[in-house]
């Protein structure tokens, strides 16, 4: 519960708090776990600890260890660990997992992005933000103190965001990034009764003897993707995999689709070879969510060939 | 009378990966599809995954995206959920939900859930 993990690049500042807090007026005590050594408290040194914090100016990956804090009042002591990792810094874009602060999730209404731990730092503007790597550049971005808001949000905005500043110690600079997750979400989805576009109730599908026909069932179910949402074919009440006839198969599209917002499934009944017994089939369309069921029934006739003798 | 049972979680170091299984018992014939959802402390709960009963399609949340990859085996009558490269904000309890219909009544079966606990 006392422990905390942090972590940071090298050649980049690094300040952590004690997980265990205390009134500004009590001395805390700043220990390296693994040798029982005392933590200066000298600004000179590169290492040293300032009451609750304990600062790396700059990080080097040999200061990865425990680190022990112990704060100490008139009646009691506290103690608390900070588990310290630094890392050295990626020459590829690609931040890994271990260096990502929490994910943030946004929408249209609420877009803002802060910047992981900055609070710690002695920082000034301007905070520069990227994404995946990429520095933010147009209108829609504003590092405003900080955190970054994102304006008229779309799920494209989802990524890694990374900011960088700059941390001041007695005149002295040092760069600090930290990187996070954002996703987008949809403040507008919801769900509805399922509503099925195709086939009509009771259509009528005129096929060829012998030739090969296709019936689409397709159905909307609301806004945003929808999950536990499915349409299927059945065949005279049965399930198309249990119906038992090879010629009669049931593909469905790999993705839902989007028709005036709303997100739509459609599944496509393929009949290969049509033969006279597949026109006494009864053909249902079934669309269903959690919040029902509707079935659309389907029934084939022949279509007589055109006469082309004079 | 189907029952849902999820199995696998249990706890990961961050960056780690969990299968977990959901097995259906029971008639499953109606089944359309089946879904994972969590519900972290204090948390609503919210989809993760799903994915159609034959199979073809598949839905993700956002925020897993690229890291966990939902299947299912018909012929066990269960579905899974890979979750890799897991984060902290992944600790939640992961229910199984079934979504059937008998006749033109649609009903939804969940399980009792499985926890996943990601921290270091």
């Known amino acids: 519960k006392f422990s905390k993990q942090s972590w940071g690049l090298e050649n980049e500042a690094l300040i952590v708090r004690c997980p265990r807090q205390g009134k500004p007026s009590y001395t805390v005590d700043w220990y390296y776990s693994q040798t029982n050594k005392s933590i200066p408290t000298q600004e000179r040194n590169r290492v040293f600890a300032s009451g609750q914090l304990l600062k790396f100016l700059p990080a080097a990956v040999a200061d990865s260890g425990i680190y022990t804090c112990i704060v100490r009042s008139p009646t009691f002591n506290r103690t608390g660990y900070a588990n310290v990792t630094i890392y050295k810094k990626q020459s590829d874009c690609n931040v890994p997992d271990y260096l990502m602060y929490s994910t943030v999730s946004g929408s249209e209404k609420n877009s803002k992005i802060y910047c992981p731990t900055i609070d710690l730092y002695n920082w000034t503007a301007p905070l520069e933000w990227f994404k995946n790597c990429q520095a933010l550049q147009g209108s829609r971005y504003r590092a405003h103190k900080s955190f970054l808001v994102i304006d008229n949000v779309m799920t494209e905005d989802a990524g890694d965001y990374t900011c960088k500043f700059i941390h001041n110690e007695n005149g002295a600079n040092y760069s600090v990034t930290a990187t996070r997750s954002f996703t987008v979400k949809d403040e507008q989805g919801f769900s509805l009764f399922p509503v099925i576009g195709a086939p009509a109730q009771n259509e009528i599908k005129e096929v060829e003897i012998g030739k090969n026909a296709n019936l689409t069932c397709s159905a909307c179910f609301g806004k945003g993707t929808q999950f536990l949402a499915a349409v299927l074919w059945q065949l005279n009440g049965t399930k198309i995999t249990d119906f038992g006839e090879p010629r009669i198969q049931q593909e469905e599209g790999q993705n839902q689709s989007f028709s005036n917002g709303l997100a739509c499934l459609d599944m496509v009944l393929r009949i290969a070879d049509v033969k006279e017994e597949d026109l006494l089939l009864q053909y249902d369309c079934l669309a269903l969510n959690l919040h029902g069921l509707r079935r659309h029934t389907v029934r084939l006739s022949r279509k007589n060939p055109i006469d082309h003798h004079s | 009378e189907v029952q849902l049972v999820e199995s696998g979680g249990g706890l990961v170091q961050p960056g780690g990966s969990l299968r977990l299984s959901c097995a259906a018992s029971?008639?499953?014939?109606?089944?359309?599809?089946m879904g994972w959802f969590r519900q972290a402390p204090g948390k609503e709960r919210e989809e993760v995954a799903a994915?159609?009963?034959?199979?073809?399609?598949?839905y993700y949340a956002d925020s897993v995206k690229g890291r966990f990859t939902i299947s299912a085996d018909n012929s066990k009558n269960t579905a899974y959920l890979q979750m890799n490269s897991l984060k902290p904000e992944d600790t939640a309890v992961y229910y199984c939900?079934?979504?059937?219909?008998?006749?033109?009544?649609?009903?939804?079966?969940w399980g009792q859930g499985t926890l996943v606990t990601v921290s270091s």
């Open positions: 994915i159609s009963w034959s199979g073809g399609r598949t």
């Open positions: 029971g008639r499953t014939d109606s089944t359309a599809s």
């Open positions: 939900a079934r979504l059937a219909f008998q006749g033109n009544t649609v009903f939804d079966l």
